[in-house]
Interface confidence: low
Amino acid sequence: LLVSQGVLLKCQKGSCSNATQYEDTGDLKVNNGTRRNISNKDLCASRSADQTVLCQSEWLKYQGKCYWFSNEMKSWSDSYVYCLERKSHLLIIHDQLEMAFIQKNLRQLNYVWIGLNFTSLKMTWTWVDGSPIDSKIFFIKGPAKENSCAAIKESKIFSETCSSVFKWICQY
């Protein structure tokens, strides 16, 4: 996954920046080699009214956010694009309460992709909104190296190869 500055999205805490503050996050290299140009505005489109948000059909609502759980399996980057095309993003977990909600709604014990990957530019784990992981709340089991992406299983976060195919969770 090639993303300029390692920052995929700029949406923070459910409120979007002014249009003048949007930045182009650069080209996303998808597994099949095609490239797409992604704007932060795409992500932020549905995030302006968290508390009164109406979730689309088949999406679950929790604390002002909407969640969609996949049944098929994709690589991390394909999962990322899938969510983005639906005006959402891969799951960003803010606290243990949200993690508990996610686990309650996962109907299988397999790994599930979330919106966290290791950016070689920053040499750190970064959520898809550009924020670093809060080590006081979460830690990642496994290698912290290039081409590592995060998946959850049983309330734990694991480092897995980004090309692995797992189910995923979209959020807006």
Partner: antibody
């Protein structure tokens, strides 16, 4: 590097604090563990402190040990030592930052005799 | 609880031979297993992490394998310098554990 200190001969029931001093890396990004080894015995995990300061202990070690840290040191307090606590105490750093799973960097250990 | 059982407790091997050490977890730990070598008077040294990845500077004659509950450390072409005690360690769960480490295997090189 990591270096343990504070080991000495202590009488039973007298609290003792061991210190692990680190250099070359930041405790704000690495998890640190304490492991001990009684003479002629195997390795015994005591507990761990996360990069964020959270602690976790082996079941047998809860209440008997307290792990804390500053910006450059990790302390292990043996709250009320018994003769069974006689051992070499090692401080170890995880291989990965902001994670744990395997201990890559070890100190030489400090000997505690109760 | 995640208990680690290591076998054998001791093994003798001739120089140039092969030695196999087994480690069994009481519950599945995926691939979160490490192997260490310890010589008298020294701290442990990480050999293998994530079940099969060789730590930096470790000779390729050391090989880790397995996943789930069963793991193996194989030392091929044993050298005198390999005489040590070897420990496995689970890196999956740090809560409600008695010990992360197996009981150890002493390797004696003849």
């Amino acid at each position: 590097s990591v270096e343990e200190s504070g080991g000495r001969l202590v009488t039973p029931g007298t609290p003792l604090t061991l210190t692990c001093t680190v250099s070359g890396f930041s405790l704000s990004t690495y998890w640190m563990s304490w492991v001990r080894q009684a003479p002629g015995k195997g390795l015994e995990y005591i507990g761990i402190i996360s990069s964020g300061g959270d602690t976790s202990y082996a079941t047998w070690a809860k209440g008997r040990f307290t792990i804390s840290k500053t910006s450059t040191t990790v302390d292990l307090e043996i709250t009320s030592p018994t003769t069974e606590d006689t051992a070499t105490y090692f401080c170890a750093r995880d291989r990965n930052s902001n994670s744990w799973g395997s201990f890559y960097l070890w100190g030489q250990g400090t000997l505690v005799t109760v | 609880d995640y208990d680690m059982t290591q076998t054998p407790a001791s093994v003798e091997v001739a120089v140039g031979g092969t030695v196999t050490i087994n480690c069994q977890a009481s519950q599945s730990i995926n691939s979160w297993l490490a192997w260490y070598q310890q010589k008298p008077g020294q701290p442990p040294k990480l050999l293998i992490y994530d079940a099969s990845d060789l730590a930096s500077g470790v000779p390729s004659r050391f090989k880790g394998s397995g996943s789930g509950k069963q793991f193996t450390l194989t030392i091929s072409g044993v050298e005198c310098a390999d005489a040590a005690t070897y420990y496995c360690q689970q890196g999956y769960s740090d809560s409600d554990v008695e010990n992360l480490f197996g009981g150890g295997t002493e390797v004696v090189v003849k």
